[in-house]
Amino acid sequence: DAEQKACPPGKEPYKVDEDLIFYQNWELEACVDGTMLARQMDLVNEIPFTYEQLSIFKHKLDKTYPQGYPESLIQQLGHFFRYVSPEDIHQWNVTSPDTVKTLLKVSKGQKMNAQAIALVACYLRGGGQLDEDMVKALGDIPLSYLCDFSPQDLHSVPSSVMWLVGPQDLDKCSQRHLGLLYQKACSAFQNVSGLEYFEKIKTFLGGASVKDLRALSQHNVSMDIATFKRLQVDSLVGLSVAEVQKLLGPNIVDLKTEEDKSPVRDWLFRQHQKDLDRLGLGLQGGIPNGYLVLDFNVREAFS
């Protein structure tokens, strides 16, 4: 086992140099010191070590820093960053935006989206800000990475980033993510008025409360059915037939094609059938006339 072998006499290196290229793998394991590698990371990147040799160096660094690399080493990683996993990165503590931007440049075009996202999450966790510069440094990575961050990380994202988010970016967000992002979007778009406001905020409406949706229904927004379907069930079921009619405007007719699918089905289930009948769309599934809802999950006959 390579771990058990001792370093041969005279083979212990005092600096990183080309001689190490000619070491056997077991000799690198036995002789190279992790702290020396950390001090001379620039040379590790300059010398044409093989992938296998670099993997050994990484193993040595991991053993030297089992709790995660210190920021002084992270700043010097350069191209060695390509050998680091997202799991490694989650252990780091990164506070310098310059370190993040440098490493994001290294990762560009290297199929390293997971590492890039982990790095930014780690930076946010340490109190950093995901400003527009950082978003630009993330380059072509879709903003769906916002949903890869934990809800805790999202607290650090500035509201201004919401201007850059598109509808598809939030597809895999949890409800908690959407709630936090919706609050940030409200803050970002607070000085936008009228229909322009609705166009911007509709991407985030999956995080809106029933109170927010009621307020929106007063503004003739004519919400499309695709946006309506993204609303959270808990918020939607609190709206009356009249409020949904105001919210959708002429698009109310599109409810018919969605009546057997969530969340429209869930909403229909909570409405009185007589109110649905007034819409004249043939919508079914409401509370039958003469029934009284005593509990959200149970229908009881009114007697």
Partner: antibody, heavy 119, light 107 residues
Framework: QVQLQESGPGLVKPSETLSLTCTVS??????????WSWIRQPPGKGLEWIGY???????NYNPSLKSRVTISVDTSKNQFSLKLSSVTAADTAVYYC???????????WGQGTMVTVSS | DIQMTQSPSSLSASVGDRVTITCRAS??????LNWYQQKPGKAPKLLIY???SLQSGVPSGFSGSGSGTDFTLTISSLQPEDFATYYC?????????FGGGTKVEIK
Amino acid sequence: QVQLQESGPGLVKPSETLSLTCTVSGGSVSSGSYYWSWIRQPPGKGLEWIGYIYYSGSTNYNPSLKSRVTISVDTSKNQFSLKLSSVTAADTAVYYCAREGKNGAFDIWGQGTMVTVSS
Amino acid sequence: DIQMTQSPSSLSASVGDRVTITCRASQSISSYLNWYQQKPGKAPKLLIYAASSLQSGVPSGFSGSGSGTDFTLTISSLQPEDFATYYCQQSYSTPLTFGGGTKVEIK
């Protein structure tokens, strides 16, 4: 390693306010990686999440208790606290403080403190 | 609120048995599902997070699976120390909610 310890009176009178404190040791309540939650368990029953606080002071409460709950954080003392007003016998439970990590799970819990609401 | 329904509510098994507990969410929660073990007079202990990831220090006899609305906790070979109550919990949406629990008793 990180430990949580609940403290506060074990007996509260109906209509009064229940006050509990959770002290964090071996770690910091100011860490941006965690939400700090209160969870309760009535005798012989299941678990109910009360709410959580982030180090910045941002809170999220269970709507079923929202009108009566306040959770606060004191970063200088490395503590967070729960206040539940207008208590009734239905609030009798073991109250736990817990840490929610970035994976969305409660990875560390206090040992719990039994609070009885009775006159 | 998302309702979490566990089944069975209790079961009797012997040491060495393979035990399966299921948890169903009232709406899709992706993989935002955690499992806990609780023994009498003690705080719950995290076993599985994100539906299938084993928490550090938890024996490999515990495993979790599922996504969307249906989830399973499996104990591959029941040990004497595994007799306890097990809870699932969703972290997809607030309020965070728990299942009603499954009590695993000695047959």
